[in-house]
């Protein structure tokens, strides 16, 4: 907290410029008008203020906007955003995707901080759902974003937004998350033809039920082993040897290398040895 002191004669700031870097903390407090700061926030980032000086500028904005900053100020916070606490951010009402992008840019290259997580949460809740443009933006900055959401949060993702999801965005999703996302993807891609559909749905198959896997096995999709290994164990177990052979196509030989791993291990144990022998891979049930 900076003490209230009178501004020395001739030091009253008329605009936000580089001369302010020579001001002591108490001088910034006394000589910079908060309303001026708010209207010229876009200049702050071009000036090499110290962390201590930024603290003073934040304090001035906090005093001017005790109920939370307006979006016109938020959009131009720049590096001052790093000074904000989650509690500060919870007071904001961010509606513009451009504002969101501007603040995410400040944190670019770093892991998602509590501040960023709170900002995103406020933004998405304000919009009511995770639309395609928002998802595009968030996954561009944080490829793991989608998988950081709870199944409950994912349920608000409309199927149309699924088009924005890239395979790498799903790398860290767990089964419960894929259970929510798979039906949305199935709906989003339903009008595509066989081979194109499989390319799009492949990353989501960790949430697919047995009947969908059986259907895919009839379409010559040649699923790779990496995808097969991510399928739900309970979805794989009812598949027959013939169905797995059709599903994997030429990749069926890869089962041998994965015979000690789930879900392959569980599936092998549930097959008749005679059926396994037809694969010619030496798999033992």
């Amino acid at each position: 907290e900076v003490e209230k002191t009178a501004c020395p004669s001739g030091k009253k700031a008329r605009e936000i410029d580089e001369s302010l870097i020579f001001y002591k903390k108490w001088e910034l407090e006394a000589c910079v008008d908060a309303a001026l700061l708010a209207t010229q926030m876009d200049r702050v980032n071009a000036i090499p203020f110290t962390y201590e000086q930024l603290d003073v500028l934040k304090h001035k904005l906090d005093e001017l906007y005790p109920q939370g900053y307006p979006e016109s100020v938020i959009q131009h916070l720049g590096y001052l955003f790093l000074k904000m606490s989650p509690e500060d951010i919870r007071k904001w009402n961010v509606t513009s995707l451009e504002t969101l992008k501007a603040l995410l840019e400040v944190n670019k290259g770093h892991e998602m901080s509590p501040q960023v997580a709170t900002l995103i949460d406020r933004f998405v809740k304000g919009r009511g759902q995770l639309d395609k443009d928002t998802l595009d933006t968030l996954t561009a900055f944080y490829p793991g974003y989608l998988c950081s959401l709870s199944p409950e949060e994912l349920s608000s993702v409309p199927p149309s937004s699924i088009w924005a999801v890239r395979p790498q965005d799903l790398d860290t999703c767990d089964p419960r998350q894929l259970d929510v996302l798979y039906p949305k993807a199935r709906l989003a891609f339903q009008n595509m033809n066989g081979s194109e559909y499989f390319v799009k749905i492949q990353s989501f198959l960790g949430g697919a039920p047995t009947e969908d896997l059986k259907a895919l096995s009839q379409q010559n999709v040649s699923m790779d082993l990496a995808t097969f290994m991510k399928l739900r164990t309970d979805a794989v177990l009812p598949l027959t040897v013939a169905e797995v052979q059709k599903l994997l196509g030429p990749h069926v030989e890869g089962l041998k290398a994965e015979e000690r791993h789930r879900p392959v291990r569980d599936w092998i144990l549930r097959q008749r040895q005679d059926d396994l022998d037809t694969l010619g891979l030496g798999l033992q049930g």
């Epitope: 767990d174 998350q177 164990t233 000690r260 791993h261 789930r262 049930g285």
Partner: antibody
């Protein structure tokens, strides 16, 4: 509900064979949905998986114990058993039997039985 | 064998604290990761299976997350009955392995 109960001698001499039985009540070892495992815990230490058996008789053992372990199932008695040969003091532990469900986790455990290897 | 490394090995916390325990696998185990709680003289109790699914009857203050090699068990608000030792376990590879355990003690 399903319950597991370990039984067997609490004291075994070095170089002899440790034999334990797990009796399943309220469920069947013949169910194709489960694996039946043995797990042990030396005093003051962590958990070590020993091996499992499937109702069909298929077994899978911890590689570090494989040469000394045999797990068998008796569906008529609704039991599965553990035999560990050539025991030493290092085999002194609480031995648990456990059921592994479809989710790949040990969802039901016996209360454990302490086995001491000493002459 | 797949090695499971838990951290920390022990921690002191107070009732109401948020507690996080991590488990790292030496290679990818997909989501085949389970968490158990064990109290002295008792058998372990399953808390979380398949990385994030809460076992029936387990309080919702327990949650799990992660996939691949890095996993987390979180207790959102520690209760007196939660002071115990926690173990992670992988069931992806046929040779199951447990983490070394994390003892949660009263501060």
């Amino acid at each position: 509900q399903v319950q597991l109960q370990e039984s067997g001698p609490g004291l075994v001499k070095p170089s002899e064979t440790l034999s334990l039985t797990c009796t399943v009540s309220g469920g069947s070892v013949s169910s194709g949905s489960y694996y039946w495992s043995w797990i042990r815990q030396p005093p003051g230490k962590g958990l070590e998986w020993i091996g499992y058996i499937y109702y069909s008789g298929s077994t899978n053992y911890n590689p570090s114990l494989k040469s000394r372990v045999t797990i068998s199932v008796d569906t008529s008695k609704n039991q599965f058993s553990l035999k560990l040969s050539s025991v030493t003091a290092a085999d002194t532990a609480v031995y648990y039997c456990a059921r592994e469900g479809k989710n790949g986790a040990f969802d039901i455990w016996g209360q454990g039985t302490m086995v001491t290897v000493s002459s | 064998d797949i090695q499971m490394t838990q951290s920390p090995s022990s921690l002191s916390a107070s009732v109401g604290d948020r507690v996080t325990i991590t488990c790292r696998a030496s290679q990818s185990i997909s989501s085949y990761l389970n968490w158990y709680q064990q109290k002295p003289g008792k058998a372990p109790k399953l808390l979380i299976y398949a990385a994030s699914s809460l076992q029936s009857g387990v309080p919702s203050r327990f949650s799990g997350s992660g996939s691949g090699t890095d996993f987390t068990l979180t207790i959102s608000s520690l209760q007196p009955e939660d002071f115990a030792t926690y173990y992670c376990q992988q069931s992806y590879d046929a040779s199951y392995t447990f983490g070394g355990g994390t003892k949660v003690e009263i501060k």
